[in-house]
């Protein structure tokens, strides 16, 4: 039989499906797959779901460059551009479109659960009410192209279909142990007790990084994460905010010890010589092991929040290291200078 009847469906909000692996719960962040380490290379755009970037966004790529060096296998070819967010994972910015709530409809109507969104930081450009959570750093679709145009997405280098190994390369000024030693030995004041020093940027209790500088984050191909535990703890630590599909991952006891080494060195790497104030600083490569997959399937509603490090994990781990990896040496100008130089060097590299 020819399906000629008009197919009308209605919704509370246009496209407010939630993501995740629990029934009717929305809003996980980041795209990866739980089965092995496939994915992150192809974007949701490639599968034709999620937000619709404008040609300007696709070409100019209002996309924040990833700050990590991706080492990955080659992926399948495509004529769609690929982009990654600052966390090295693929992202998508969802337009804040929302259709007015519908009334009772036909039997085949698909109703989509409405979400009560918090006010977005960025005003929607689509002229519709905001659809979901805080979108700082994301932009809505740009102006439509010329009606009827058939321009294709510019071709960019093929992304990986495998989960890239992310390595943050930390370049520090060439170490000269002797020079560093001599500088430190001239310190006129005794070294401060590092255990009680607060970081320049803030102690780990206040370490809350919320990336917001990116513009349009385009997620590559949606992928599946339905059974993976969160990077920062078990599912018990994932708190769903019904208001917008936004998930804040809270970790009460986040132990970085076996996954992260500080850029300049944790206290484990600082040897205190009582007499001479001699400090040995070992610079390590910052390595994040991707041993925990993030939780999202195709996701269109991607709002990434870095885990909050609440409370001191242990006085040995990060308590003396600032969020930039520098050590607060307020009472030691020489060491502070060295730390500042390292920080400046890192800053030059965008780290």
């Amino acid at each position: 039989a020819e399906p000629r009847q008009e197919f009308e469906v209605m919704e509370d909000h246009a496209g407010t499906y939630g993501l995740g692996d629990r029934k009717d719960q929305g809003g996980y962040t980041m795209h990866q797959d739980q089965e092995g380490d496939t994915d992150a290379g192809l974007k949701a755009e490639e599968a034709g779901i999620g937000d619709t970037p404008s040609l300007e966004d696709e070409a100019a790529g209002h996309v924040t460059q990833a700050r990590m060096v991706s080492k990955s296998k080659d992926g399948t070819g495509s004529d769609d551009k690929k982009a990654k967010g600052a966390d090295g994972k693929t992202k998508i910015a969802t337009p804040r479109g929302a259709a007015p709530p519908g009334q009772k409809g036909q039997a085949n109507a698909t109703r989509i659960p409405a979400k009560t969104p918090p006010a977005p930081k960025t005003p929607p450009s689509s002229g519709e009410p905001p659809k979901s959570g805080d979108r700082s750093g994301y932009s809505s679709p740009g102006s439509p192209g010329t009606p009827g145009s058939r321009s294709r997405t510019p071709s960019l280098p093929t992304p990986p279909t495998r989960e890239p190994k992310k390595v943050a390369v930390v370049r520090t000024p060439p170490k000269s142990p002797s020079s560093a030693k001599s500088r430190l030995q001239t310190a006129p004041v005794p070294m401060p007790d590092l255990k009680n020093v607060k970081s320049k940027i803030g102690s780990t209790e206040n370490l809350k990084h919320q990336p917001g500088g990116g513009k349009v984050q385009i997620v590559y191909k949606p992928v599946d994460l339905s059974k993976v535990t969160s990077k920062c703890g078990s599912l018990g630590n994932i708190h769903h905010k019904p208001g917008g599909g936004q998930v804040e991952v809270k970790s009460e006891k986040l132990d970085f010890k076996d996954r992260v080494q500080s850029k300049i060195g944790s206290l484990d790497n600082i040897t205190h010589v009582p007499g001479g104030g001699n400090k040995k600083i070992e610079t390590h490569k910052l390595t994040f092991r991707e041993n925990a997959k993030a939780k999202t399937d195709h996701g269109a509603e991607i709002v990434y929040k870095s885990p909050v490090v609440s409370g001191d994990t242990s006085p040995r781990h990060l308590s003396n290291v600032s969020s930039t990896g520098s050590i607060d040496m307020v009472d030691s100008p020489q060491l502070a200078t060295l730390a500042d130089e390292v920080s400046a060097s890192l800053a030059k590299q965008g780290l």
Epitope: A47, T52, S54, S78, D80, G97
Partner: antibody, heavy 119, light 111 residues
Framework: QVNLRESGAEVKKPGASVKVSCKVS????????MHWVRQAPGQGLEWMGW????????KYAQKFQGRVTMTRDTSITTAYMELSSLRSDDTAVYYC????????????WGQGTLVTVLA | SYVLTQPPSASGTPGQRVTISCSGG????????VSWYQQLPGTAPKLLIF???QRPSGVPDRFSGSKSGTSAPLAISGLQSEDESDYYC???????????FGGGTKVTVRS
């Protein structure tokens, strides 16, 4: 309410072209991808490709490369799918389907357009 | 032939539980989320399950999806006569660079 309304049935001869339209209402047209899926009589569903309603960028299934053209007119919130060099096995119901934005799938479908290719 | 494999038919009596399998490979189900569609005779498909196990509002909770490895079954518990329909699974395929569907499963409710 979201509504995808497709054009009426078409009868074509082999070698001809057909252009099916999908008029959209109830949501921001440019905020979603539009996919085209076809279904031959008594057969399953077959994905043909998508068009980014905002930018006009397209992606086509390998099988239809060179024969299909997807366009859209944002001023009238309508997407089009044109299939050329028609063959008898192109006889099918052609559906437009909206790509979900916050989930993985096609959340709304048009009612379908039957295209019959007769020798 | 279809990239995703579904049984051509499945049946049950009212109140029974019916499970429809959908199997694929590492490039599709193994690495991407699955959606399910219900197509009543003579109508367009309707989204039934998205992102493996999510139900759009309005879809009865008798329908449940899951995914394990390269297989993604759809379960219908408490089968009802109105569930008599064709069911299709779909996902993105990394290798084919396109969406792929299963061949469809016709569910019959025996009275």
């Amino acid at each position: 309410q979201v509504n995808l309304r497709e054009s009426g049935a078409e009868v074509k001869k082999p070698g001809a072209s057909v252009k099916v339209s999908c008029k959209v209402s109830g949501y921001t047209f440019t905020g979603y991808y539009m996919h085209w899926v076809r279904q031959a009589p008594g057969q399953g569903l077959e994905w043909m490709g998508w068009i980014n309603s905002n930018s006009g960028a397209t992606k086509y299934a390998q099988k239809f490369q060179g024969r299909v053209t997807m366009t859209r007119d944002t001023s009238i919130t309508t997407a089009y799918m044109e299939l050329s060099s028609l063959r008898s096995d192109d006889t099918a119901v052609y559906y437009c389907a909206r790509g979900a934005r916050d989930g993985y799938g096609f959340d709304y479908w048009g009612q379908g357009t039957l295209v019959t290719v007769l020798a | 032939s279809y990239v995703l494999t579904q049984p051509p038919s499945a049946s049950g009596t009212p109140g029974q539980r019916v499970t429809i399998s959908c199997s694929g490979g590492s490039s599709n189900i193994g690495s991407n989320a699955v959606s399910w569609y219900q197509q009543l005779p003579g109508t367009a498909p309707k989204l039934l399950i998205f992102t493996n196990d999510q139900r759009p509002s309005g879809v009865p909770d008798r329908f449940s999806g899951s995914k394990s490895g390269t297989s993604a079954p759809l379960a219908i518990s408490g089968l009802q006569s109105e569930d008599e329909s064709d069911y299709y699974c779909a996902t993105w395929d990394d290798s084919l660079n396109g969406w792929v569907f299963g061949g469809g499963t016709k569910v019959t409710v025996r009275s």
